[in-house]
Amino acid sequence: GLECDGKVNICCKKQFFVSFKDIGWNDWIIAPSGYHANYCEGECPSHIAGTSGSSLSFHSTVINHYRMRGHSPFANLKSCCIPTKLSTMSMLYFDDEYNIVKRDVPNMIVEECGCS
Amino acid sequence: GLECDGKVNICCKKQFFVSFKDIGWNDWIIAPSGYHANYCEGECPSHIAGTSGSSLSFHSTVINHYRMRGHSPFANLKSCCIPTKLSTMSMLYFDDEYNIVKRDVPNMIVEECGCS
């Protein structure tokens, strides 16, 4: 997956730091105080749709076969720049019963982006 | 995840059968001859972005906090109707060395859709 560098407008991963205080979650998340969540942005022209090597690759490659041949309804279906690889991060937080929990939370950090 | 029923234009799962013969893959995929791959289509208005209960839910909920508050650049970032739950299917196929392989292939079938 591409890293956004300001020079490309193709689907890429943009660095982004989330502050839990900013979004009002610091009342239940003890640590960390924030993290690099990152996000995906950019264009997905038809020639790169479904070519991300993502977890959706078999499915998106299949759909792209139809899209590239102008098969209705896929010709009009927009391909999206989305997370294709996410990673886990450890957090210390209060659960519903106010117990302190330390847990690896899946799908917190966007590692790679690709076109759906 | 919603099933498309022709009445809603909100992000939903559309039934779709893929014929491997149609896409020219029947030379290497022995069986099955096709499968219900399905796909996602529909609108993702801001009030349902990141509310899909998807595998991206922590990340997309975080991003949505910023989006809903009009935080640049998320206010302009389009939320996409994407697969949020995929399932595995068994396939019988020729590998690169023309051995016949029977294997469960992940992420072949879209089971649920949601907004990124």
Epitope: - | F17, S19, K21, D22, I30, A31, P32, S33, G34, Y35, S90, L92, I100, K102
Partner: antibody, heavy 116, light 105 residues
Framework: EVQLVQSGAEVKKPGESLKISCQGS????????IGWVRQMPGKGLEWMGI????????RYSPSFQGQVTISADKSISTAYLQWSSLKASDTAMYYC?????????WGQGTLVTVSS | SYELTQPPSVSVSPGQTASITCSGE??????ACWYQQKPGQSPVLVIY???KRPSGIPERFSGSISGNTATLTISGTQAMDEADYYC????????FGGGTKLTVL
Amino acid sequence: EVQLVQSGAEVKKPGESLKISCQGSGYSFTSYWIGWVRQMPGKGLEWMGIIYPGDSDTRYSPSFQGQVTISADKSISTAYLQWSSLKASDTAMYYCARQGLGFDYWGQGTLVTVSS
Amino acid sequence: SYELTQPPSVSVSPGQTASITCSGEKWGEKYACWYQQKPGQSPVLVIYQDTKRPSGIPERFSGSISGNTATLTISGTQAMDEADYYCQAWDRSTVFGGGTKLTVL
């Protein structure tokens, strides 16, 4: 609702020709293979052959090659099984079946009786 | 040519487990499917891709593969399960087994 509706029972004399039909509805007829299966009185199932209505690609069991002809007319979602010269040993129930992940839908069967 | 061998008949008491075998070669290169056929009716797919059950088929039906044998198992057999059962080997073409008559005593 997926349905395969076969033509009615036939009584023929040896040497006569015959064409029986199988009409599909409730699904994309051109995207699934249709198989034909013979069941002689009091006996088991025998696979005769299969056709892909999308392009009329046909495969026969070695036992039935040259004995019958399988065809399809996609404009009316119908597959056919025909004989140019019937024999008494062709007396049987003939089923058409849609090939999905196996023969997932079957016609009601056409009983063919060949007797002098 | 490829052949599948099934026992002609299997008997089971109600509530017991019935096992129907299907012997053939190279199951690693083929899928096993199983069909149930009741008198005067069309066959019904009960197991596909070796072990999977179509929607609407009761959980008591299961399939397995071990070595050269595919097996259909019916646990807690009911009177309504009395029927002929056919295995099918599916790759580029198709072969059916000779069929097994299941009798529920």
